[in-house]
Interface confidence: low
């Protein structure tokens, strides 16, 4: 599992190495909402019909990675299933192929910016704006991620359980 | 595995500039960021900053604002980190380190001398 | 910038024993939604940082159970119990809440 994925787990408070059938095939999105209490203060002042507040135009135009991501977890969706606490899990199996890539990569963005903001807990910059990307409104990929991590072998074969670093190694992870 | 392979030893003259580099394998750098850390000789630990490769947003403490620049070529997983008109204060040990700073690579010592 | 202050340059502690290692930041680490972004590393001599606690007390994946991390919004420690030869080093605590982030001076770990 990716490291946006692990670090959403353990945001939900899913501390075990275990992960859950239904995703141990799905991998590029993250799939477990961010609980309420675990949003930083910026974002609950962020409306959240507007998933692109503090984004800069460059990175709300629709990247080749991001579609790639998009389209690997609508094939994730369709064949997998989704996580019952997934913010993606209401309905979605029904209506995701209506819904155009931009609004799904609407809202891909805005659950890596909701995760990159709990992982860090940085504030928007005063100043930010829609134009004026805040340093966390940028995309963290896996921030959750300090967790019990295991997340190095998990990122080097997605499938693969992580085996526990050995305390000794450098990757040592959090 | 996830490795972080940091390129050598660096001896160059005040004034110059290098660019490091940091090679990951294991995991796909787009999904993570990387950030570089200082380390002087005998001394402590400080941030300079982190890119996200993906997009190419970075980040940088203020007193490497104008001398480091942080960037990253996806297709050859690999995160850079690069340095202009070096002095002696710039000799030191960079590390990079993935975005949670749980995997860090062996460290590139950078010598700055005439 | 938040300044993170290690008292204690080094501390020397007999293999077997237990001991704590503090650590300050000059502004409140607890963020309002009850996280607490503080990170403690060791750096064994020769060798890169190994990241030990994340989030103030959650240990890192592979860390013996020996260390822990504790605290308060600006007071912070780092306890390992029943010493080891392999855990001799330098632990520092790091800040991830404001940019830039920062380290504290570092405290090393000696065998008495």
């Known amino acids: 599992m990716k490291r946006k994925e692990r670090i959403a787990r353990r945001l939900e408070g899913i501390e075990t190495d275990t992960q859950p059938i239904l995703l141990q095939s799905c991998t590029g999105l993250v799939t477990h909402r961010l609980l309420e209490e675990d949003t930083p203060r910026y974002m609950r002042a962020t409306d959240p019909a507007s998933p692109h507040i503090g984004r800069s135009n460059e990175e709300e135009e629709t990247s080749d990675s991001s579609l790639e991501k998009q389209t690997r977890s609508k094939q994730c969706t369709e064949t997998s299933g989704i996580h019952a606490d997934s913010p993606y899990s209401s309905g979605i199996m029904d209506t995701q192929s209506l819904e155009s890539k931009a609004e799904r990569i609407a809202r891909y963005k805005a659950e890596r910016r909701r995760q990159l903001a709990e992982k860090y807990g940085l504030t928007l910059d005063p100043e930010a704006d829609s134009e004026t990307p805040s340093r966390y409104s940028r995309s963290r990929k896996d921030p959750e991620a300090a967790e019990k991590r295991g997340v190095r072998s998990e990122r080097s074969a997605e499938s693969s359980r992580d085996a526990g670093s050995s305390y000794s190694r450098t990757e040592l992870s959090g | 595995e996830v490795q972080l392979q940091q390129s050598g030893a660096e001896l160059v003259r005040p004034g110059a500039s290098v660019k490091l580099s940091c090679t990951a394998s294991?995991?796909?750098?787009?999904?993570?960021?990387m950030h570089w850390v200082k380390q002087r000789p005998e001394q402590g630990l400080e941030w300079i900053g982190w890119i996200d490769p993906e997009n190419g947003d970075t980040e940088y403490a203020s007193k490497f604002q104008d001398k480091a620049t942080i960037t990253a070529d996806t297709s050859s997983n690999t995160a850079y980190l690069q340095f202009s008109s070096l002095t002696s204060e710039d000799t030191a040990v960079y590390y990079c380190t993935t975005g949670e700073f749980d995997n860090w690579g062996q460290g590139t010592t950078l010598t700055v001398s005439s | 910038d938040i300044v993170m202050t290690q008292a204690a340059p080094s501390i020397p502690v007999t293999p077997g024993q237990s001991v704590s290692i503090s650590c300050r930041s000059s502004?409140?680490?607890?963020?309002?939604?009850?996280?607490?972004?503080l990170y403690w590393f060791l750096q064994r001599p020769g060798q890169s940082p190994q990241l030990l606690i994340y989030r103030m007390s959650n240990l890192a994946s592979g860390v013996p159970d020996r260390f822990s991390g504790s605290g308060s919004a600006t007071a912070f420690t780092l306890r390992i119990s029943r010493v080891e030869a392999e855990d001799v080093g330098v632990y520092y605590c790091?800040?991830?809440?404001?940019?830039?982030?920062?380290f504290g001076a570092g405290t090393k770990l000696e065998l008495k």
């Open positions: 294991g995991f796909n750098i787009k999904d993570d960021h």
């Open positions: 502004k409140s680490l607890l963020h309002s939604n009850g996280n607490t972004y």
């Open positions: 790091m800040q991830h809440l404001e940019y830039p982030f920062s």
